[in-house]
């Protein structure tokens, strides 16, 4: 025999004090599949957590974090607090990237700055604490005579021509 | 050990003010965020104030905004909550709570560790 539960799509629950008819999930509770004998509470949004998307009777409430604030864990169990660019939260708190390191987000670790070197290139921008080198040809490409790319022309002032 | 033990509950008539606190000792309290959570008698846990590590974010239930205010001396190891225009609804056993990880704040199902409580009575 079938069960009849299992006729009940999500966003109802299978009613064992009505005869095991489908009812619709009460406020503030969804089943997300069929045939289930209860719905689910939906989760609430409140304080550093807010709503990024509202409960449905067939799906729970999703949240996010307040600005100054960033998810952690899964379904963002968790908000974080942000640090500034260039710097990196640690046991005591949010801290400066040390010396040839650097961090362009409000969240997650510093990391050294790219080794030019290894790839046989040369700096072309200097690193900071929020942001990475710029590698630039390799030191060979910037030999006098093996430049590709052509001189600008000489600026002329107005009113003389060539000689 | 984590220890946190709340102090300042009492009777007081509805409009009057009460301040509780909180004091924290076994963990650097300055590296975690703080909260308050009652029960009122035969209901369930109710999340009341939220606290950053730094004492510079707040966060409160909709029901409470405006009368309480949640605060944090880091140098003293002591959560406060000041309670103004206090409401028979707001008779409750209040706790204290620590969040589980530094500079983050948490769900209530994930606090690690509780106070023991303190009870406010708001009645005539």
């Known amino acids: 025999l079938q069960d009849p539960c299992s006729n009940c799509p999500a966003g109802t629950f299978c009613d064992n004090n009505r005869n095991q008819i489908c009812s619709p999930c009460p406020p503030n509770s969804f089943s997300s599949a069929g045939g289930q004998r209860t719905c689910d509470i939906c989760r609430q949004c409140k304080g550093v957590f807010r709503t990024r998307k509202e409960c449905s009777s067939t799906s729970n409430a999703e949240c996010d974090c307040t600005p100054g604030f960033h998810c952690l864990g899964a379904g963002c169990s968790m908000c974080e607090q942000d640090c500034k660019q260039g710097q990196e939260l640690t046991k005591k708190g949010c801290k400066d990237c040390c010396f040839g390191t650097f961090n362009d987000q409000k969240r997650g670790i510093c990391r050294p700055w790219t080794n030019c070197s290894l790839d046989g290139k040369s700096v072309l921008v200097n690193g900071t604490k929020e942001r990475d080198v710029v590698c630039g040809p390799s030191p060979a490409d910037l030999s006098p005579g093996a430049s590709s790319v052509t001189p600008p022309a000489p600026a002329r002032e107005p009113g003389h021509s060539p000689q | 050990q984590v220890q946190l033990v709340e102090s300042g509950g009492g009777l007081v008539q509805p409009g009057g003010s009460l301040r509780l606190s909180c004091s924290a000792s076994?963990?650097?309290?300055?590296?975690?965020?703080m909260s308050w959570v009652r029960q009122a008698p035969g209901k369930g846990l109710e999340w009341v104030s939220d606290i950053n590590s730094g004492g510079e974010s707040t966060f409160y239930e909709d029901s409470v905004k405006g009368r309480f205010t949640i605060s944090r001396d880091n140098a003293k190891n002591t959560l406060y909550l000041q309670m103004n225009s206090l409401r028979a609804e707001d008779t409750a056993v209040y706790y204290c709570a620590k969040h589980p990880l530094t500079y983050t704040i948490a769900t209530m199902n994930d606090y690690d560790y509780w106070g023991q409580g303190t009870l406010v009575t708001v009645s005539f």
């Open positions: 076994g963990f650097t309290f300055s590296s975690y965020a």
